[in-house]
C-alpha cells in the first residue's frame, strides 16, 4: 500500500498554513515598520552577526540534532525549519504588540529579530519530545501556542520581577523543556508492535545529529550573550559559556564511556551532553567572574546529562512516550533547573557577602520567577497537547509514527512500506 499523506491533511495543511501566513502578512502590513534610524552601517553588520549565529543554531543546530531517527530524519530537519520560519514571524509581532503597541506601530530592529529567533528556538527545543508523532498542521498550532505563552511569560516576568532581557529569556530552557514534556504526555503513548525500529537511530542520521550538536556547541556562547547590555557582560558570558561547554564535552565523552559496561561511548549521550555546560551556565554566564567556576559548572552539567541519559529514558518512554533518542526535553529540564539553582546560589553568596539583609527577598523573587515559568510551561503545554489531540488535525496513525514517507515524496520508492 502506498504511504500517502492523508487526504484530509492535504486539504487542511496548505489552507491552514497559507491562511495563517496571509494573516501574518496583513498584520505586518498594518502594524509594523523598520527602524529607520541606523546611522552606523558597521554597527549594523556586527549586530546582524549575532542574529545570524542564532539562526544557524536554530536551523542547522537544532534542526540536525533532532534528525537521528532511522526513518524520520528528513522530517525532523525540514519541520524544524518550517517551525522556525513561522515562529520568528509570530514572535516579532507578539513581542512588538506586548512591548511597543501603545505607541501605534511595532518597530522592527535587528534586536527584535534576535529576540524572535530565541523565542522560536524554544519551540525547536520542545518539539524534540513530539517529533515523529505529529504532522505539520499540529506543529503550526504548537508554534503559535508556545511562542504566545513564552512571550506572555517574558512580559509578566519583566513587569512583575523587573528582570532584564537576558534573565527573562534564560527561562527558555526550563520553559521549553517542561512545555515539550507536557505536550508529549498528552499525545498517544504506546508505539504499536512493529514500529519500534523506526524510533531507533541510524548511523547516517546520527552523524547529522552530531553535526547539529557541533553547530550548537560552536554558537552557544552567542546564544547566552545575545541579550546582554554591556561589553563586559557579553565578554564574561562568551568566555564562561565557552569554558563550560568545553568541559562538558570532555565530561560527556568520558562519562559516557564510564557509564557503559564495556567502556563504549553512546552517540545519544554525547549529542546532548556536549551542550550541557551551555544550558547550565546560561542564567548566570555574565555574572561569573572567573573561568574555574564556569568549568566546574560544565563538569557537573556533563555528569548530570550523562546520568540523566542513562537512567531517565526508560521512565520518559513509559510515562511520556518519548523515544530514547529524544532526550533534549528531560536533559534541558534538569540542566535548566541546575542553571536556575546556580543563579540563586550566586545570589545568596552575593547578598551574604554584602550583608545587606535582602537575601530572603531576592531568593524568593528568583524562585517565584522559576515557578511561574514552570507553571506556565506546564499549563500551556497541556493546553497544546489537548488541542493536538483534536480530530481535525488528522494526526498520523500510530503505525506511521517516525516515518518520513508519510510526509515526503521519495521518487526512488515506487511503493510504500
Amino acid at each position: 500500500m502506498s504511504s500517502k499523506y492523508p487526504r484530509s491533511v492535504r486539504r487542511c495543511l496548505p489552507l491552514w498554513a497559507l491562511t495563517l501566513e496571509a494573516a501574518l502578512i496583513l498584520l505586518f502590513y498594518f502594524f509594523t515598520h523598520y527602524d529607520a534610524s541606523l546611522e552606523d552601517q558597521k554597527g549594523l553588520v556586527a549586530s546582524y552577526q549575532v542574529g545570524q549565529d542564532l539562526t544557524v543554531m536554530a536551523a542547522i543546530g537544532l534542526g540536525f540534532l533532532t534528525s537521528s531517527f532511522r526513518r524520520h530524519s528528513w522530517s525532523s530537519v525540514a519541520f524544524n525549519l518550517f517551525m522556525l520560519a513561522l515562529g520568528v514571524q509570530w514572535a516579532i509581532l507578539l513581542d512588538g504588540f506586548l512591548s511597543q503597541f501603545p505607541s501605534g506601530k511595532v518597530v522592527i530592529t535587528l534586536f527584535s529579530i534576535r529576540l524572535a529567533t530565541m523565542s522560536a528556538l524554544s519551540v525547536l527545543i520542545s518539539v524534540d519530545a513530539v517529533l515523529g508523532k505529529v504532522n505539520l498542521a499540529q506543529l503550526v498550532v504548537m508554534v503559535l501556542v508556545e511562542v504566545t505563552a513564552l512571550g506572555n511569560l517574558r512580559m509578566v516576568i519583566s513587569n512583575i520581577f523587573n528582570t532584564d532581557y537576558h534573565m527573562n529569556m534564560m527561562h527558555i530552557y526550563v520553559f521549553a523543556a517542561y512545555f515539550g514534556l507536557s505536550v508529549a504526555w498528552c499525545l498517544p503513548k504506546p508505539l504499536p508492535e512493529g514500529t519500534e525500529d523506526k524510533d531507533q537511530t541510524a548511523t547516517i542520521p546520527s552523524l547529522s545529529a552530531m553535526l547539529g550538536a557541533l553547530f550548537l556547541w560552536m554558537f552557544w556562547p552567542s546564544f547566552n550573550s545575545a541579550l546582554l547590555r554591556s561589553p563586559i557582560e557579553r565578554k564574561n558570558a562568551v568566555f564562561n559559556t565557552y569554558y563550560a561547554v568545553a568541559v562538558s564535552v570532555v565530561t560527556a565523552i568520558s562519562g559516557s564511556s564510564l557509564a557503559h559496561p564495556q567502556g563504549k561511548i553512546s552517540k545519544t549521550y554525547v549529542h546532548s551532553a556536549v551542550l550541557a555546560g551551555g544550558v547550565a551556565v546560561g542564567t548566570s554566564c555574565h555574572l561569573i567572574p572567573s573561568p574555574w567556576l564556569a568549568m566546574v559548572l560544565g563538569l557537573v552539567a556533563g555528569l548530570i546529562s550523562v546520568g540523566g541519559a542513562k537512567y531517565l529514558p526508560g521512565c520518559c518512554n513509559r510515562v511520556l512516550g518519548i523515544p530514547h533518542s529524544s532526550i533534549m526535553g528531560y536533559n534541558f529540564s534538569l540542566l535548566g533547573l541546575l542553571g536556575e539553582i546556580i543563579y540563586i546560589v550566586l545570589l545568596v553568596l552575593d547578598t551574604v557577602g554584602a550583608g545587606n539583609g535582602m537575601i530572603g527577598f531576592q531568593v524568593l523573587l528568583s524562585i517565584g520567577e522559576l515557578s511561574l515559568a514552570i507553571v506556565i510551561a506546564l499549563m500551556s503545554g497541556l493546553l497544546t497537547g489537548l488541542l493536538l489531540n483534536l480530530k481535525i488535525w488528522k494526526a498520523p496513525h500510530e503505525a506511521k509514527y517516525f516515518d518520513d514517507q508519510v510526509f515526503w515524496k521519495f521518487p526512488h520508492l515506487a511503493v510504500g512500506f
Epitope: D35, L38, E39, D40, G43, L44, A46, S47, V50, T109, L110, F111, R114, N162, D164, Y165, M167, R229, S230, P231, I232, E233, S284, H286, L287, I288, P289, L346, L347, L349, D350, T351, G353, A354, N356, M358, F361, Q362, L365
Partner: antibody, heavy 126, light 108 residues
C-alpha cells in the same frame, strides 16, 4: 578628558521635528551605552531613552515612545535623538549621558550614568 | 514602573550640619540605586552608585546606605559647595529608569 557635548536644540513648533546630537570624546564611545535625560523648566530629571553600546537595542520612556528615536554612529562618536511630533510638554533641557556598568561580587550588574553633557535647550512653542 | 519618592522635597541647613535625604522605592530594588547632585544651570553629577559606593573624586563626607525600598544619602558635614538639588535614581527596573523628584538643599 571625557566629554559629551549636545547640540541641535532650539525653538520648534508643536507637531514638527527636531534632531539633537551629542558628540563624545575622551573615551571609547563604542564600548558604552548612552542615554538621553531631560529636565523641564523648574522640574526634576526625566529619563527619555537608552541605546546599547552596539546600537542593537533601544528603550524609551512611555511618554516619548513612538515619537522619539535614539540612534548612534559609533564611527563618528555621536549620539542622536530624533524628535518627531513634538508637544509643549517636550520643552526641556536635554542631556546626553554615558552608561557605566559595574559589578560587585556575583550580583546583577549595576548601571549608572557617570558622565553627562552640559545640555541643550528645546522649546516647543507656536 | 517603579516609582521613587524623595523626602524632604527641600531643606535648609547650615555649613557643618549633618544632612540626611531619604529615598523610597515603590517596590524592592535591592541596592540598584544611584544618587546625583545638580547645581543650578549645570548638568547632574554622579555621587553614589549601588546604594553605597562612592564615585571616584567625590568627597568622603557623602555616604549612602539602604537596600530594598528604603535608602538614605548622608552629608556628614555640609560644605558651601554642597548646596544643590539631589536626585535618587533606580536602575533595577531596566529598561525604564526613574528618578526621584529631587531634594533641594538650601542655605539656612
Amino acid at each position: 578628558q571625557v566629554q559629551l557635548v549636545e547640540s541641535g536644540g532650539g525653538v520648534v513648533q508643536p507637531g514638527r521635528s527636531l534632531r539633537l546630537s551629542c558628540a563624545a570624546s575622551g573615551f571609547t564611545f563604542s564600548s558604552y551605552g548612552m542615554h538621553w535625560v531631560r529636565q523641564a523648566p523648574g522640574k526634576g530629571l526625566e529619563w527619555v531613552a537608552v541605546i546599547w553600546y552596539d546600537g542593537s537595542n533601544k528603550d524609551y520612556a512611555d511618554s516619548v515612545k513612538g515619537r522619539f528615536t535614539i540612534s548612534r554612529d559609533n564611527s563618528k562618536n555621536t549620539l542622536y535623538l530624533q524628535m518627531n511630533s513634538v508637544r509643549a510638554e517636550d520643552t526641556a533641557v536635554y542631556y546626553c549621558a554615558r552608561e557605566l556598568s559595574t559589578q560587585r561580587g556575583y550580583s546583577r550588574y549595576h548601571y549608572v550614568m557617570d558622565v553627562w553633557g552640559q545640555g541643550t535647550t528645546v522649546t516647543v512653542s507656536s | 514602573d517603579i516609582q521613587m519618592t524623595q523626602s524632604p522635597s527641600s531643606l535648609s541647613a547650615s555649613v557643618g550640619d549633618r544632612v540626611t535625604i531619604t529615598c523610597r522605592a515603590s517596590q524592592s530594588i535591592s541596592t540598584y540605586l544611584n544618587w546625583y547632585q545638580q547645581k543650578p544651570g549645570k548638568a547632574p553629577k554622579l555621587l553614589i552608585y549601588a546604594a553605597s559606593t562612592l564615585q571616584s573624586g567625590v568627597p568622603s563626607r557623602f555616604s549612602g546606605s539602604g537596600s530594598g525600598t528604603h535608602f538614605t544619602l548622608t552629608i556628614s558635614s555640609l560644605q558651601r559647595e554642597d548646596f544643590a538639588t539631589y536626585y535618587c535614581q533606580q536602575s533595577y527596573g531596566t529598561p525604564t529608569w526613574t528618578f526621584g523628584q529631587g531634594t533641594k538643599v538650601e542655605i539656612k
